[in-house]
């Protein structure tokens, strides 16, 4: 089971209208450039077999991957939103740095790996798709971690 006290974000992190709006604007702009609407990264498959108490830990993994493998490499695109949203998400990632799971997290790593593989397989369009789903990442992170 997760060490729940560390797998938590304060509600106030998600009660900042300006950065929430910028995150959703960034997602909207990127989704307009996403021509692969059949695939969804953040959906039922990602959470399959994951209990309520493990959801935040899973979302931490997704957040870290999105920052390191998608947002940082694409940081010159979708301005001015990107330069504001990336530091915000990086702060959330930092706050979840002590969120760990005691015991087996293989089922979670397997689910996250499928998301990573999908993004990598799609190449740059996979990265655009991930940015286009930042609204879902934001909301899923909120719902899982507060």
């Amino acid at each position: 089971a997760p060490i729940s006290s560390h797998c938590r974000l304060d509600k106030s992190n998600f009660q900042q209208p300006y950065i929430t709006n910028r995150t959703f604007m960034l997602a909207k702009e990127a989704s307009l450039a996403d021509n692969n609407t059949d695939v969804r990264l953040i959906g039922e498959k990602l959470f399959h077999g994951v209990s309520m108490s493990e959801r935040c830990y899973l979302m931490k993994q997704v957040l870290n991957f999105t920052l390191e493998e998608v947002l940082f490499p694409q940081s010159d695109r979708f301005q001015p939103y990107m330069q504001e949203v990336v530091p915000f998400l990086a702060r959330l990632s930092n706050r979840l740095s002590t969120c760990h799971i005691e015991g087996d997290d293989l089922h979670i790593q397997r689910n996250v790996q499928k998301l990573k593989d999908t993004v990598k397989k799609l190449g740059e369009s996979g990265e655009i798709k991930a940015i286009g789903e930042l609204d879902l990442l934001f909301m899923s992170l909120r719902n899982a971690c507060i």
Epitope: K11, H48, R142, I146
Partner: antibody
């Protein structure tokens, strides 16, 4: 094909107990949480409680103490134990699968089983 | 606990009409809102989640919008099979789990 079938409803006297069953097929209870919802005659939907993948249970405040959700994964069945029943517990009781997609959504639902509490 | 207020509680409409149902939350629920359709004697059926995402197999004449506290379900051109009762449902996280899932009172769509 995913299917949920409730059973165990019927007529029970005030103060009595009843155990409802929800038999599932087409998916595993180790992969999905399950909820119970009820609907009094001519009224709206009311959430009762949920049993998570790991067996943890959570209840609506009004249901705590009288209602208990459990499961038997080997039988692919979820149960709702109802005690100290009152006339106002008369309702159709539904089970549904909880699909978390970043937010909880309930799909599909069973056909429901009617519980009538009357003397 | 969040309270969801649906309006109207009932409405009469004709086939082909555009129908709009609203759901107001007593607190900010972001986009954590779903819509369900229920026909007499049947179980509810998921129509929309994330306030605006159409569930699999649901006709495109159904659409949802809104965020925060005000939400709308629209049927662009009412069909005979759409006469039913519609419920909004919210998920509220971060509070006590005993009030996580809440349903609105329902809106009955009847034939004019």
């Amino acid at each position: 094909e995913v299917q949920l079938v409730e059973s165990g409803g019927g007529l029970v006297q005030p103060g009595g107990s009843l155990r409802l069953s929800c038999a599932v097929s087409g998916f595993s209870l180790s992969s999905y949480a399950m909820i119970w919802v009820r609907q009094a005659p001519g009224k709206g939907l009311e959430w009762i409680g949920i049993i998570d993948i790991d067996g943890s249970t959570y209840y609506a405040s009004w249901a705590k103490g009288r209602f208990t959700i459990s499961r038997d994964s080997s039988k692919n069945t979820v149960y709702l134990q109802m005690n100290s029943l009152r006339a106002e517990d008369t309702a159709v009781y539904y089970c549904a699968r909880d699909r978390f997609v970043g937010v909880d959504i309930f799909e599909p639902w069973g056909q429901g089983t009617l519980v009538t509490v009357s003397s | 606990a969040v309270v969801l207020t649906q309006s109207p509680s009932s409405l009469s409409a004709s086939v082909g009409d555009r129908v709009t149902i609203t759901c107001q939350a007593s607190e900010d629920i972001y986009t954590n809102l779903a819509w369900y359709q229920q026909k007499p004697g049947k179980a509810p059926k998921l129509l929309i989640y994330w306030a605006s995402t159409l569930a699999s197999g649901v006709p495109s004449r159904f659409s949802g919008s809104g965020s925060g506290t005000d939400f709308t379900l629209t049927i662009s051109s009412l069909q005979p099979e759409d006469f039913a009762t519609y419920y909004c449902q919210a998920c509220v996280y971060g509070n006590s789990a005993d009030s996580r899932y809440t349903f609105g009172g329902g809106t009955k769509v009847e034939i004019k």
